[in-house]
């Protein structure tokens, strides 16, 4: 189920790459965030808290990512036209409950000016 398009700027371009921003409520302590391209999982990041509030970050499908208190950024490099597609942030909230899955996304348009290594 697609819950809706992101209500924020999801794609930030720089240096021939793109930062894809996946937000989550900052009250959330334990979660899994997956980046989907179409229906395919490109990246994931899981944050859990153990005893003594020790934080564990795991990735099964590793991408360069950055975690803040309310978002996960995934970075894609060397953009080419094949990157143009629908991208979705698939958030699974574990804690605090209730367990909840939301899917939000948008279309990544690739323009000449954003390509990594443009042919002159």
């Amino acid at each position: 189920e697609i819950n809706g398009s992101a209500n924020y700027e999801m794609f930030i371009f720089h240096n021939g790459g793109v930062q894809i921003l996946c937000k989550y409520p900052d009250i959330v302590q334990q979660f899994k965030m997956q980046l989907l391209k179409g229906g395919q999982i490109l990246c994931d990041l899981t944050k859990t808290k153990g005893s003594g509030n020790t934080v564990s970050i795991k990735s099964l499908k590793f991408c360069h990512s950055q975690l803040s208190n309310n978002s996960v950024s995934f970075f894609l490099y060397n953009l080419d036209r094949s990157h143009a597609n629908y991208y979705f942030c698939n958030l699974s909230i574990f804690d605090p409950p209730p367990f909840k899955v939301t899917l939000t996304g948008g279309y990544l348009h690739i323009y000449e000016s954003q390509l990594c290594c443009q042919l002159k």
């Epitope: 937000k23 409520p25 900052d26 808290k49 605090p96 409950p97």
Partner: antibody, heavy 121, light 106 residues
Framework: QVQLQQSGPELVRPGESVKISCMGS????????MHWVKQSHAKSLEWIGL????????NYNQKFQGKATMTVDKSSSTAYMELARLTSEDSAIYYC??????????????WGAGTTVTVSS | ENVLTQSPAIMSASPGEKVTMTCSAS?????MHWYQQKSITSPKLWIY???KLASGVPGRFSGSGSGNSYSLTISSMEAEDVATYYC?????????FGGGTKLEIK
């Protein structure tokens, strides 16, 4: 149906502590976190904090750190909040509220009826 | 702290009249929720995620907005809408409520 049943009104002296309760029914208690909210004439509504029944993790509004302590007893499906070193400014109605999520954020989807705490000598 | 300012603080409307109340945030928020509170009862979830109506809320209610400015609108005022309405932001710690708009009927 889903209900949050709160304990009765409390009249306490300045400097004392009070522990109020919120019992959940009509749903699986451990499947939701619980928030506490203060309502006073002076400050309208204020979020105090939340306790995860799943992990016992707590998240306090810094303003209430040291004033409020949230705990939970899973066996009786009850959340508790203790208020310490009471002053007249703590006189208010205290609500528990069940946590839920929308697509973008979280909110209180069910509220208790409130517990009135009066601090007076 | 993100201060939510609701205006007007008190308003009255005639039956059938359109009503709009606003909630202004000192810092931008991703979404706003609204609660309705009738006298001597606890608040009830009324609108969540800016524009979604909670279960049992009449269709004459709607919510909109983004960034620093949000609003709740009643397309046609009815007597049962008399209450105080509070906005709430849960997108930036510490989570805050507005001071409320008290809606009365003429």
């Amino acid at each position: 149906q889903v209900q949050l049943q709160q304990s009765g009104p409390e009249l306490v002296r300045p400097g004392e502590s009070v522990k109020i309760s919120c019992m959940g029914s009509g749903y699986t208690f451990t499947d939701y976190a619980m928030h506490w909210v203060k309502q006073s004439h002076a400050k309208s509504l204020e979020w105090i904090g939340l306790i995860s029944i799943y992990s016992d993790h707590t998240n306090y509004n810094q303003k209430f750190q040291g004033k409020a302590t949230m705990t939970v007893d899973k066996s009786s499906s009850t959340a508790y909040m203790e208020l310490a070193r009471l002053t007249s400014e703590d006189s208010a109605i205290y609500y528990c509220g069940r946590n839920n999520y929308g697509n973008y954020g979280w909110y209180f989807d069910v509220w208790g009826a409130g517990t009135t705490v009066t601090v007076s000598s | 702290e993100n201060v939510l300012t609701q205006s007007p603080a008190i308003m009255s409307a005639s039956p059938g009249e359109k009503v709009t109340m606003t909630c202004s945030a000192s810092s931008s928020v991703s979404y706003m929720h609204w609660y309705q509170q009738k006298s001597i009862t606890s608040p009830k979830l009324w609108i969540y995620d800016t524009s979604k109506l909670a279960s049992g809320v009449p269709g004459r209610f709607s919510g909109s907005g983004s960034g620093n400015s949000y609003s709740l609108t009643i397309s046609s005022m009815e007597a049962e809408d008399v209450a105080t309405y509070y906005c709430f932001q849960g997108s930036g710690y510490p989570y805050t409520f507005g001071g409320g708009t008290k809606l009365e009927i003429k």
